[in-house]
Interface confidence: medium
Amino acid sequence: KFSKQSWGLENEALIVRCPRQGKPSYTVDWYYSQTNKSIPTQERNRVFASGQLLKFLPAAVADSGIYTCIVRSPTFNRTGYANVTIYKKQSDCNVPDYLMYSTVSGSEKNSKIYCPTIDLYNWTAPLEWFKNCQALQGSRYRAHKSFLVIDNVMTEDAGDYTCKFIHNENGANYSVTATRSFTVKDEQGFSLFPVIGAPAQNEIKEVEIGKNANLTCSACFGKGTQFLAAVLWQLNGTKITDFGEPRIQQEEGQNQSFSNGLACLDMVLRIADVKEEDLLLQYDCLALNLHGLRRHTVRLSRKNPIDHHS
């Protein structure tokens, strides 16, 4: 459960996150499992640990192996394992299956392709995108933040999409590429006024100060893959990106699912290290589509420690 597969290409940057999570204040120690040798934290090393992250700058085939991370708090230790494999660069265009991230599917109405793992890196826009090794050109393709949008998706748009970006570490630049398959579904469907399944209107969510909290905004929009549908969070009526609190982040990418034949989207809001002032904010789950907008408001309250222990 607490082991994670990670892979990369030689001479590219690879950053791996410890599968065990902890507060930012907790220390994380990394070891090379085969030798139990500690991974250094000094950034002058090609491979070094930086809190929850293990950085290969750049990676080498010899780095392949299992790495152990131990999250240490005053009261407990948690152990996780990162199974890292570094591959030689292919001379031809084919991207082998073992280098592919999860397949995403889209349709004529929904065509975002997210660049895998990019949130681990210190990168700046724009992303470069390639399909079957060819650079994407034309007005139908738009690189937006960490995803690619394809307007008017057609069956011919199916294929392997590679994002390429530059990771910057202390002034040094390292290339990173990641590839995933994109499949196209052709379907007709109905569009309904959005129905928010969670959270309930005016819900009070109990949280513990100092712990992490997740809020999920989930809504259904009709039958079939939906065009012009979005779910998002706002804080005190402001978009998360404009609010400017780095501890509170919206997950990049909306997860699409189907419930009783209805197309649903969800967006997770992650609050790290909950603070007292977070209890004063209004959290709005917004669901929008071409018919309009629905809004459910959530507020946070302090969880009673006695309830927690019982």
């Epitope: 004529e108 109405k109 929904n110 065509s111 975002k112 738009r142 937006h144 949008v149 307007d151 007709q188 469907g189 109905f190 569009s191 309904l192 006024f193 039958k223 065009f227 012009l228 549908a229 979005a230 998002l232 034949g261 929008l288 589509n289 071409l290 018919h291 309009g292 907008l293």
Partner: antibody, heavy 118, light 112 residues
């Protein structure tokens, strides 16, 4: 009240492009979809495409694929429709319309006449 | 794409008399939630279209109650109980059940 005000009439040469604007007022711009519908002289209504300003995704009718681009500027509550490689048959009145909880096209702009002539 | 067929294409009516316009779709517009995704729009001479009826039978706010819509599945009707001079224009049905939205060819209502 809810209003959509479009830019003025345009006369264009074949092969050129036209960009029509649609400024919204009286509601929260990013909360509703914006669509573009055209009407050639003496003809019916034809949906060209639409977008939800907050989602960054636009979608177009196949007929206009590759020629039309719909964008939106949330800071000015303005939607734009750009049609390229104009030909004489693109001569029409172009309407922007707001989606809504009632009909698909709840509120309409006053229309922009685009004439394509050499 | 869904094809919407209206009839008649021209409708001369005497003021005070009723009028009826038919609209047929090539596929069902009825959703399992009971809604028919069909709108009716009126375009008066020299004006932009305006929404009259949505979901086949629901009158848009501000529209006179002499207008009514009915039908389900593939067959729909717009009725005007007593036509007034201000009702002249072209009436369009439009389906929003299947992507992309498509309009009927229009019915021109004129006063006799």
């Amino acid at each position: 009240q809810v209003q959509l005000v479009q830019s003025g009439a345009e006369v264009k040469k074949p092969g050129s492009s036209v960009k029509v604007s649609c400024k919204a007022s009286g509601y929260t711009f990013s909360d509703f979809s914006i669509h573009w519908v055209r009407q050639a002289p003496g003809q019916g209504l034809e949906w060209m495409g639409g977008m939800l300003p907050i989602s960054h995704i636009a979608h177009y009718a196949r007929k206009f694929q590759g020629r039309v681009t719909i964008t939106a500027d949330e800071s000015t509550s303005t939607a734009y429709m750009e049609l390229s490689s104009l030909r004489s048959e693109d001569t029409a009145v172009y309407y922007c319309a707001r989606g809504g909880s009632s009909g698909w096209f709840e509120v309409w702009g006053q229309g922009t006449t685009v004439t394509v002539s050499s | 794409d869904i094809v919407m067929t209206q009839s008649p294409l021209s409708l001369p009516v005497t003021p005070g008399e009723p009028a009826s316009i038919s609209c047929r779709s090539s596929q069902s517009l009825l959703h399992s939630n009971g809604y028919n995704y069909l709108d009716w729009y009126l375009q008066k001479p020299g004006q932009s279209p305006q929404l009259l009826i949505y979901a086949a039978s629901t009158l848009q706010s501000g529209v006179p109650d002499r207008f009514s819509g009915s039908g389900s599945g593939t067959d729909f009707t717009l009725k005007i109980s007593r036509v007034e001079a201000e009702d002249v224009g072209v009436y369009y049905c439009m389906q929003g059940a299947h992507w992309p939205p498509t309009f009927g060819q229009g019915t021109k209502l004129e006063i006799k």
